[in-house]
């Protein structure tokens, strides 16, 4: 029961995380104009991974896409790549984890396969979360560097008479969304991996009680292999699986005619 809960919770947390990563990637507020030196501006600038926007006090907002690939900074391209990789891995992970969920029965899928799929999706979520966190952190680092560089040349004068205020950018909402979302995906992935570890032993214990006589005792070796004691070794010619300690009788989830022979 705890394993199912852990797996389900891991899936939900990862789902929220990946939705957040997608949202962050699409958001325009990766960097927003720093208003510290010019709090009375009537024009507000903010930038995303795909376009930059200008919002005027009047409410009119104009956004322009970055219609160039070669002209963009390498760091921005790297951040885009990390976020897309994170989304793709997360999406695949979600797809895999849906089939791996204990509460969902698909055909004659073995629990060992479900355990492996849970582990696979968990790893995918972890990598996805790390990609998002890395992408957002790289962008944040880029902002900090540019912020202090622009602060150094904040004012460029023409004979000291005319001032040109250079626009500085600070952390936008998308960065915080990305960090939180990446963290959630990472946590969800860890939960899936933990669920995978507990998936097989719980399965075997439950099945052993349901399929054997009450006097039949089942012992577990630390390695996770089943060792039968009592009525002889493997009396019903049941195949022992290394991965999930499962029997041929247990392949199908619903009762079949073989269960009653």
């Amino acid at each position: 029961m705890a394993v199912t809960a852990c797996q389900g919770l891991g899936f939900v947390v990862s789902l929220i995380g990946i939705a957040g990563i997608i949202a962050a990637t699409c958001m325009d507020q990766w960097s927003t104009q720093d208003l510290y030196n010019n709090p009375v501006t009537a024009v507000f600038n903010y930038q995303g991974l795909w376009r930059s926007c200008v919002r005027e006090s009047s409410g009119f907002t104009e956004c322009r896409g970055y219609f160039t690939l070669l002209g963009l900074p390498a760091m921005l391209q790297a951040v885009r790549a990390l976020m897309i990789v994170g989304i793709v891995l997360g999406a695949i992970g979600l797809l895999v984890s849906i089939f791996a969920l204990k509460c969902i029965r698909i055909g004659s899928m073995e629990d060992s396969a479900k355990a492996n799929m849970t582990l696979t999706s968990g790893i995918m979520f972890i990598v996805s979360g790390l990609c998002a966190i890395a992408g957002v952190s790289v962008f944040a680092n880029m902002l900090v560097t540019n912020f202090w560089m622009s602060t150094a040349n904040m004012y460029t004068g023409m004979g000291g008479m005319v001032q040109t205020v250079q626009t500085r950018y600070t952390f936008g909402a998308a960065l915080f969304v990305g960090w939180v979302a990446g963290g959630l995906t990472l946590i969800g992935g860890v939960m899936m991996c933990i669920a995978c570890r507990g998936l097989a032993p719980e399965e075997t214990n439950y099945k052993a009680v349901s399929y054997h006589a009450s006097g039949h005792s089942v012992a577990y070796k630390p390695g996770g292999f089943k060792a039968s004691t009592g009525f002889g070794s493997n009396t019903k010619n049941k195949k022992i699986y290394d991965g999930g300690a499962r029997t041929e009788d247990e392949v199908q989830s619903y009762p079949s005619k073989h269960d009653y022979v």
């Epitope: 024009v43 001032q163 040109t164 626009t167």
Partner: antibody, heavy 117, light 113 residues
Framework: QVQLKESGPGLVAPSQSLSITCIVS????????ISWVRQPPGKGLEWLGV???????HYHSALISRLSISKDNSKSQVFLKLNSLQTDDTATYYC???????????WGQGTSVTVSS | DIVMTQSPSSLTVTVGEKVTMSCKSS????????????LTWYRQKPGQPPELLIY???TRESGVPDRFTGSGSGTDFTLTISSVQAEDLAVYYC?????????FGAGTKLELK
């Protein structure tokens, strides 16, 4: 059709308060802002302040202590209140609607205010 | 506050003449985000409220004749009337719409010779 119309007292005594109402039609005050501009007789334009659709306000730094702008969205009315009037506050007061680039594309006809005892 | 300086304060012209007036700001009105200059030009005819001519320093308001041209960037701006008409005899104001307060220039008065 966008229209703005100012209505004021005409004559105000020094040290008193001035209240002007701008009634708008053809657009919503929840979406668009209203700027106030005045023009002393024979002189240039002076921007006083603005109230935006979201209710946020900005005032001219020289008038911030005695100027307030408010609005009633449901009645499509914007109010300007200027306290402690002096003779140099004598002017024609205009309300205007800003849009693209914060430029004012529609103006009222203005209301003339004289500060005199 | 951004100070707007207009020159000349008055211009005496004849109908059909080309006219140029200047507006300088104490700070740059160029927004790096969209590379637009937040400067506006108005025309005020005697006894009338001002009317918008040009925004973003060079974009003509709809209905404004194409004889009006705005140019310039950063701190130096120009309004050009290619062929002055009788109805153009008015006072022309530039306005900073980039930073509060949204200050006006003192105006350039266009008079008939």
């Amino acid at each position: 059709q966008v229209q703005l119309k100012e209505s004021g007292p005409g004559l105000v005594a020094p040290s008193q308060s001035l209240s002007i109402t701008c009634i708008v039609s053809g657009f919503s005050l929840t979406t668009y802002g209203i700027s106030w501009v005045r023009q002393p007789p024979g002189k240039g334009l002076e921007w006083l302040g603005v109230i935006w659709g979201d209710g946020s306000t900005h005032y001219h730094s020289a008038l911030i202590s005695r100027l307030s702008i408010s609005k009633d969205n449901s009645k499509s009315q914007v109010f300007l209140k200027l306290n402690s009037l002096q003779t140099d506050d004598t002017a024609t007061y205009y309300c205007a609607k800003p849009y693209y680039s914060n430029a004012m594309d529609y103006w009222g006809q203005g209301t003339s205010v004289t500060v005199s005892s | 506050d951004i100070v707007m300086t207009q020159s000349p304060s008055s211009l005496t012209v004849t109908v059909g003449e080309k006219v140029t007036m200047s507006c300088k700001s104490s700070q740059s009105l160029l927004n790096s985000g969209n590379q637009k200059n937040y400067l506006t030009w108005y025309r005020q005819k005697p006894g009338q409220p001002p009317e918008l001519l040009i925004y973003w320093a060079s974009t003509r308001e709809s209905g404004v004749p194409d004889r009006f041209t705005g140019s310039g960037s950063g701190t130096d701006f120009t309004l050009t009337i290619s062929s002055v008409q009788a109805e153009d005899l008015a006072v022309y104001y530039c306005q900073n719409v980039y930073s509060y307060p949204l200050t006006f220039g003192a105006g350039t008065k266009l008079e008939l010779k």
